[in-house]
C-alpha cells in the first residue's frame, strides 16, 4: 500500500486529515463518487472540534457529509459507529420527511446554514466536503 504524508494541492490539513471543500453542488451519490476517486470519503464528523472546523470553512451553506441511512440505519461512510459517535442534528431531525413531493423520504445528512445537521433528499445538488486521513496506508487490491 501507499501512504499519504501531505495533503494534495488545494486541500486543507487539519488534525492529520486533509479536507477539500467544493464550490459547486452535486447529488450525494455523485459527491461520494467524487471523493472516492480522490482516495477520500465524504467528511465524517467525529468531534465538536471537527464540526467547528468544517463549519468555519463551509459557511452558512447546505453541504453534504458522509452520513446516510439509505439502507436502513444511519451509517458513516468510513464505518465510524453512528450510535456511539458525535451527533449534531437540528431539533426534531432527522425526520425522514416525505412531504417534499420528490418521492421517498430523506436519507442523506447535510450541514445546514447554522452548521447543525438535517436529513434531506439525496438528489439535491448541495456542496460537499471530502476528507482523507494522513499517514494511513491505503490498501491496494491484489492484481488478478
Amino acid at each position: 500500500g501507499s501512504e499519504r504524508t501531505c495533503c494534495p494541492v488545494n486541500w486543507v490539513e487539519h488534525e492529520r486529515s486533509c479536507y477539500w471543500f467544493s464550490r459547486s453542488g452535486k447529488a450525494w451519490a455523485d459527491a461520494d463518487n467524487y471523493c472516492r476517486l480522490e482516495d477520500a470519503h465524504l467528511v465524517v464528523v467525529t468531534s465538536w472540534e471537527e464540526q467547528k472546523f468544517v463549519q468555519h470553512h463551509i459557511g452558512p451553506v447546505n453541504t453534504w457529509m458522509g452520513l446516510h441511512d439509505q439502507n436502513g440505519p444511519w451509517k458513516w461512510v468510513d464505518g465510524t459507529d453512528y450510535e456511539t459517535g458525535f451527533k449534531n442534528w437540528r431539533p426534531e431531525q432527522p425526520d425522514d420527511w416525505y412531504g417534499h413531493g420528490l418521492g421517498g423520504g430523506e436519507d442523506c445528512a447535510h450541514f445546514t446554514d447554522d452548521g447543525r445537521w438535517n436529513d434531506d433528499v439525496c438528489q439535491r445538488p448541495y456542496r460537499w466536503v471530502c476528507e482523507t486521513e494522513l499517514d494511513k496506508a491505503s490498501q491496494e487490491p491484489p492484481l488478478l
Epitope: 476517486l37 480522490e38 490498501q139 487490491p141
Partner: antibody
Amino acid sequence: EVQLLESGGGLVQPGGSLRLSCAASGFTFSSYAMSWVRQAPGKGLEWVSAISGSGGNTFYADSVKGRFTISRDNSKNTLYLQMNSLRAEDTAVYYCAKKDYDYVWGSPYFDYWGQGTLVTVSS
Amino acid sequence: DIQMTQSPGSVSASVGDRVTITCRASQGINNWLAWYQQKPGKAPKLLIYAASSLQGGVPSRFSGSGSGTDFTLSISSLQPEDFATYYCQQTDSFPFTFGPGTKVDIK
C-alpha cells in the same frame, strides 16, 4: 515528460478474454486517478472505467460492468484492464488517460492520453 | 446518465474563419466540462477544462465558455492544423460521457 503506452490489444473471439496494460512514466503515478476510454472504428469516444490513485476505488460504464476489471500496480507504474466475455461491440481502440483536476472548482479532466491499442472481437 | 449533444455534427470552414461549436448537457453540470481535439489515427488532446480554462500549450485562439447545460468552444481564426474532430466531455457524474463529436473540415 508524461508518457502513457498501451499494449495487449489484438484479435480475440467472442466470449474470450484479453488484458490490456498501460505503462506510465514522467509523473508520480500513484498520486493520480486513471481511466480507460475506447473508440469503436469510425465512432466517438466512450468512457469505460476509472480507478483511484491507490487502486482502492473503481468505477465502470454500465456497458462493461461485470465483464471488465480495472486495476493498477503502483510499484510498476502500470494500469490494467482485464476484459472478459468479450463481445463484437467491444471492438475499439482502447486509450488509457491520466486524470487531473481544476484546482479551483475540482472539475476533473484527462490531460494526457496514450496512443491506444486496438482490440478486435471477431470469430 | 447525462447525455451530451453537439452541434453542428460537422462544419466546413476556411483558414481564418471563426468557428463555434455548441455542446449541451441533458442536465446541469456546473462548469464540469472539457473539450478535446482529435486528429485521424491519433489520441485525443485536451484543449479546455472547467468549461473555460485553457490547457497549457494550447493556442489562445481556442476558447471555451458556458455553465449549467450550454457550452461553446470557439476557434477565433482557424488554422490548417485545426482541421480535426472536437469532443466535449462532462465530468460532473459517472459515467463521464462524451458528446458525439463535431468534425471541422476544409471548405
